[in-house]
Interface confidence: low
């Protein structure tokens, strides 16, 4: 995506979304290469804000402050033209985060979805944000922006993502901006991992010594498959978090992970999924559900479901 004949292409690395105090490299690509260039900030009426400085290849801007947020353009060096400079580049919006309290990010119906389904990511805050921005980790393109809805002292926006495909899986964060400062964003929400299931064949799940055990007896759940999964994920119905283990190749050419549950106290329905290291947020079909029953248990109450940890890091690699 380069500029036109006499139009440079301005880009930002690693992202156009920069934390306050961070750095960003602005690159001006002109005529099949990086030449000398000049930078402009649009809200200064095209007057160079960099004291007439000329840059080569890239300019590292930072540590950034809220004042750095805005729209930038560059002009490439063109010695034989009347002005000595090319036409202005594409506009590039730099957004600076960390200027307001972080919003909250929720997934409806939940963060674990089947391929082809649609998820609503709701970003909300008691700060009266005018706009909300949704950004997927590792994506250099601009975040998606929606106008906030204000109701009963809460501002929110619903981002509809789908039909879900592997490319849409990953770690999402949202930000808010207040009126009249559209590119000065809040601190990021806690990360939310969107996981897509149903892409690969289901693993099998079994229990040792068996699916019905005595209270206090040690239970291990084994997830295995002929597919060379790198990681297995074990979930229990009613619990919001999952456990994960690295898959181990077995002599019989299957790939297996053994989840020790410890002394049995409560039963439950379990499922497992497989995934590959390269796509940690894209999981297999669910195994058939496995009901683990505990006999001789004086208490039939379940532990209260735990909230998913914001640092769950499902979409980060297991090292």
């Amino acid at each position: 995506l380069m500029g036109g004949q006499d139009k440079p292409f301005l880009s930002a690395r690693p992202s156009t979304v920069v934390p306050r105090g961070g750095h960003v490299a602005l690159q001006c690509h002109y005529r099949r290469g990086f030449n000398n260039f000049m930078l402009y900030k649009e809200d200064r009426s095209h007057v160079p804000i960099f004291h007439g400085r000329i840059f080569q290849e890239s300019f590292i801007m930072g540590p950034v402050t809220p004042a750095h947020a805005g729209t930038y353009r560059c002009r490439g060096s063109r010695p034989h033209s009347l002005t000595g400079w090319s036409a202005p580049s594409n506009p590039l919006v730099i957004m600076v985060t960390g200027n307001h309290r972080k919003p909250s990010l929720l997934a409806h119906p939940g963060p674990l979805l089947k391929s082809g389904e649609t998820v609503i990511l709701q970003c909300w805050s008691d700060v009266m944000f005018e706009h909300f921005f949704l950004h997927r980790e590792g994506i250099s393109e601009d975040p998606s922006r929606l106008v906030g809805q204000i109701h009963d002292g809460v501002s929110k926006a619903n981002f509809s993502i789908g039909p879900l495909m592997p490319v849409l899986a990953g770690t999402y964060r949202c930000y808010g901006s207040v009126p009249h400062s559209p590119y000065q964003l809040s601190a990021p929400s806690d990360p939310l991992d969107i996981v897509i299931t149903g892409l690969y064949e289901k693993p099998s799940l079994s229990a040792q010594p068996g699916p019905t055990v005595q209270a206090g007896e040690n239970v291990t759940l084994s997830c295995s498959s002929w597919s060379s999964y790198d990681i297995y994920h074990l979930s229990r119905e009613g619990e919001a978090h999952e456990r994960r283990l690295r898959a181990v190749p077995k002599v019989n050419r299957t790939f297996q992970a053994d989840f020790p549950l410890g002394p049995a106290t409560h039963g439950g329905t379990y499922r497992c999924f497989g995934s590959f290291r390269a796509l940690p947020c894209v999981w297999s079909n669910s195994s058939d559900p496995l009901l683990v029953s505990v006999t001789g248990n004086p208490s039939s109450s379940w532990p209260s479901p735990t909230e998913p940890s914001s640092k769950s890091g499902i979409c980060r690699h297991l090292h």
Epitope: S144, V147, G162
Partner: antibody, heavy 120, light 107 residues
């Protein structure tokens, strides 16, 4: 019930200004953004911009940036749009519309429209 | 800015027919799409929101479908009151552009 009632038709000379009003009733005025849409004779719909009555924040379609000024009076639950430096091509019906709530909201209520005719 | 391309621009049909109007966005708008009906001299009226949801009071012969960049409004068994102009509109960030409109006329 929700109602958006707009001011009556206007005939103006080129170069003049006009202020169109949109009075809201039946809901909390400050809880919804108010948008303006234009329709030239025999043409389609064009989004002009919006105002958030609770903050006064406005956002314009670049095409109309220097043409329109949007304001809101929360005491009377009325949104206004002023069109300046009128030209014949500004002859159109101007609608106000409320952006709804909930999942991926649309314009759920519209005013009846105000016809602005620019003619010398 | 996102462009909305609506087709056809006009359509002749008879009472009882089934008609389909399509709207193509220049980029993925993630179902942030509404359909409106406008009759001569009147304000537009909401038919469908979030691509597939029917607005209150809209007859069930209207339906919306689609995702990504491609969306469709279908009217099953056309009634005399359905002859009007139809517009799509996206809400995936400002400016909220409309499609060019489809004028549905009696054959």
């Amino acid at each position: 019930q929700v109602q958006l009632v707009q001011s009556g038709a206007e005939v103006k000379k080129p170069g003049a200004s006009v202020k169109v009003s949109c009075k809201a009733s039946g809901y909390t005025f400050t809880s919804y953004t108010m948008h303006w849409v234009r329709q030239a004779p025999g043409q389609g719909l064009e989004w002009i911009g919006y105002i958030n009555p609770s903050s006064g924040y406005t956002e314009n379609n670049r095409k109309f940036k220097d043409k329109t000024t949007m304001t809101a009076d929360t005491s009377t639950s009325t949104a206004y749009m002023e069109l300046s430096s009128l030209r014949s091509e500004d002859t159109a019906v101007y609608y106000c519309a409320r952006l709804g709530k909930g999942l991926l909201p649309p314009f759920d209520y519209w005013g009846q429209g105000t016809t602005v005719t620019v003619s010398s | 800015d996102i462009q909305m391309t609506q087709s056809p621009s006009s359509l002749s049909a008879s009472v009882g027919d089934r008609v389909t109007i399509t709207c193509r966005a220049s980029e993925n708008i993630y179902s942030n799409l509404a359909w409106y009906q406008q009759k001569q001299g009147k304000a537009p009226q909401l038919l469908v929101y979030a691509a597939t949801n029917l607005a209150d009071g809209v007859p069930s012969r209207f339906s919306g479908s689609g995702s990504g960049t491609q969306y469709t409004l279908t009217i099953n068994s056309l009634q005399p009151e359905d002859f009007a102009t139809y517009y799509c509109q996206h809400f995936w960030g400002t400016p909220y552009t409309f499609g060019g409109g489809t004028k549905l006329e009696i054959k």
